[in-house]
Amino acid sequence: EVQLLESGGGLVQPGGSLRLSCAASGFTFSLYSMNWVRQAPGKGLEWVSSIYSSGGSTLYADSVKGRFTISRDNSKNTLYLQMNSLRAEDTAVYYCARGRAFDIWGQGTMVTVSS
Amino acid sequence: DIQMTQSPSSLSASVGDRVTITCRASQSVGTYLNWYQQKPGKAPKLLIYATSNLRSGVPSRFSGSGSGTDFTLTISSLQPEDFATYYCQQSYSIPRFTFGPGTKVDIK
C-alpha cells in the first residue's frame, strides 16, 4: 500500500528549530518529486517546498525561503524538512505529498511555535 | 505569483443538491487546475487533475470544467460524505503550486 508518514512535529519556541521527516513506502520513491504543504489552524493549504526526484533542485515559498531546507535520502525512502528560525506564523499541520499530482498525502504532523 | 480565488467561501446545501464551486486564477493557467477534498482532521485528497480528469476511485458525480482563468467543480447530487472543504490548486507555474482559499460545503 502506498503510504507517507510524517513525524518530527512538536512544540518549539520562536527562533527554534525542528526537523520533519516523511517516510515513504509502497512505491519507488526515487522516481517522484516530493512536496511539503502546510495548513495553519482553521486556515487553507499553503505550498511550502518541493524537491526534484534526484534531490538536485529545491524550491521554496517566499514565506520560508532562507529558513527552511527540504532534502531527501532516496536510499532511505525519506523526505525531510529542516525548519530554522521558526516564527509563530509557522504554526501549522505539515503534510508531505507525492509528485506533480499531489496524489498521495501523509496524515500530517503538527508544529506549534509558541513561547 | 499566480493568485487563486474561490467562490463562495462557504455554502450550505442538502443531500441530493447540485453544487457548483468556482475557482479563478489571476492569470491563465491553461488546464493545469486540480481539485482537492479535505475533511476535518484529515489530509486533503486529490479529486480531479488537469481541470476535468477524475482521479481513479472518485465518484462520477464529481466533475470539473474550465480553462484559462475560470474553473468549476460540480457535484451533481450531493451525498452525506461530500460535506467537506474543497480547494483548487494551479500546477501551471510549477513549482509554485498555489492553492485557492477553499470552499466549505456544509449541511443546510
Partner: antibody, heavy 120, light 107 residues
Framework: EVQLLESGGGLVQPGGSLRLSCAAS????????MIWVRQAPGKGLEWVSY????????WYADSVKGRFTISRDNSKNTLYLQMNSLRAEDTATYYC?????????????WGQGTLVTVSS | DIQMTQSPSSLSASEGDRITLTCRAS??????LNWYQQKPGRAPKLLMY???TLQSGVPSRFSGSGSGTDFTLTISGLRPEDFATYYC?????????FGGGTKVEIK
C-alpha cells in the same frame, strides 16, 4: 541543444559481451536520471535499465538482470551499458534516453539508437 | 509488473480525421502515463506526459486524458506527419513498461 549519442553496438556471438556508451550534451547531465530502452527488429519498445542522477540507484528489467550493468560517469557526461552473456533475444536497437529530473514523467529526449546483433 | 495494453493495434485513417487511441494499465497508475510517437527508423518522441500535459513543441491537435487505469490519446485533425506508431508508457513504478503500440496508417 539536448543531444544523446549512442555508440558501441555491433555484431557479437551468443555468450559474448559489449559495452554501449551514450554521450550527453546540451544539458546538465549530473542532475538527470538516465534510461536504456531497446527495440527488437519490427517489435515494440522495452525498458531495459534506469540509473539515478548520482548513479547510486539502478534498476533492471527481469530479462537482463544479472547480465547487464548500467553505470554513468558524470564528469564525462556519459552513460554506459555493460552487456554480458548476450543472447539472440538481446538483438535490438538500444536507445539511451533522459529521465525527468522533476518527476516521474518518462524519458523526454532520446538518442538515435545503436544496433546490437547477437548471432553466431 | 504493470502491464500496459493498447488498442487498436493498428488503424487506418484519412487526413483530417479525428482518431482516439486507448491505453489500459493492469493496475492504477494515477496520472503517470506518457505517450510517444515513433516513425520508422527513428527514435521515439515524447508527445504527452502526466496523462494530459503536452510536451513543449507538440501541436495542440494532440490531447490526452484519463487517470487510474484507462487513458486516451486523441489527434483532432490528422496530418500527413502524424502517420506513425504510438506507444503509451507507465512511469508509476519500476519496471517502466510500454504498451504494444498502435500503428496509424493512411487509409
Amino acid at each position: 541543444e539536448v543531444q544523446l549519442l549512442e555508440s558501441g553496438g555491433g555484431l557479437v556471438q551468443p555468450g559474448g559481451s559489449l559495452r554501449l556508451s551514450c554521450a550527453a550534451s546540451g544539458f546538465t547531465f549530473s542532475v538527470y536520471p538516465m534510461i536504456w530502452v531497446r527495440q527488437a527488429p519490427g517489435k515494440g519498445l522495452e525498458w531495459v535499465s534506469y540509473i539515478s542522477s548520482s548513479g547510486g540507484q539502478t534498476w533492471y528489467a527481469d530479462s537482463v538482470k544479472g547480465r547487464f550493468t548500467i553505470s554513468r560517469d558524470n564528469s564525462k557526461n556519459t552513460l554506459y551499458l555493460q552487456m554480458n552473456s548476450l543472447r539472440a533475444e538481446d538483438t535490438a536497437t538500444y536507445y539511451c534516453a533522459r529521465g525527468d529530473d522533476y518527476d516521474s514523467s518518462g524519458p523526454d529526449y532520446w538518442g538515435q539508437g545503436t544496433l546490437v546483433t547477437v548471432s553466431s | 509488473d504493470i502491464q500496459m495494453t493498447q488498442s487498436p493495434s493498428s488503424l487506418s485513417a484519412s487526413e483530417g480525421d479525428r482518431i482516439t487511441l486507448t491505453c489500459r494499465a493492469s493496475q492504477s497508475i494515477s496520472i503517470y502515463l506518457n505517450w510517444y510517437q515513433q516513425k520508422p527508423g527513428r527514435a521515439p518522441k515524447l508527445l504527452m506526459y502526466a496523462a494530459t500535459t503536452l510536451q513543449s513543441g507538440v501541436p495542440s491537435r494532440f490531447s490526452g486524458s484519463g487517470s487510474g487505469t484507462d487513458f486516451t490519446l486523441t489527434i483532432s485533425g490528422l496530418r500527413p506527419e502524424d502517420f506513425a506508431t504510438y506507444y503509451c508508457q507507465q512511469s508509476y513504478d519500476i519496471p517502466l513498461t510500454f504498451g504494444g503500440g498502435t500503428k496509424v496508417e493512411i487509409k
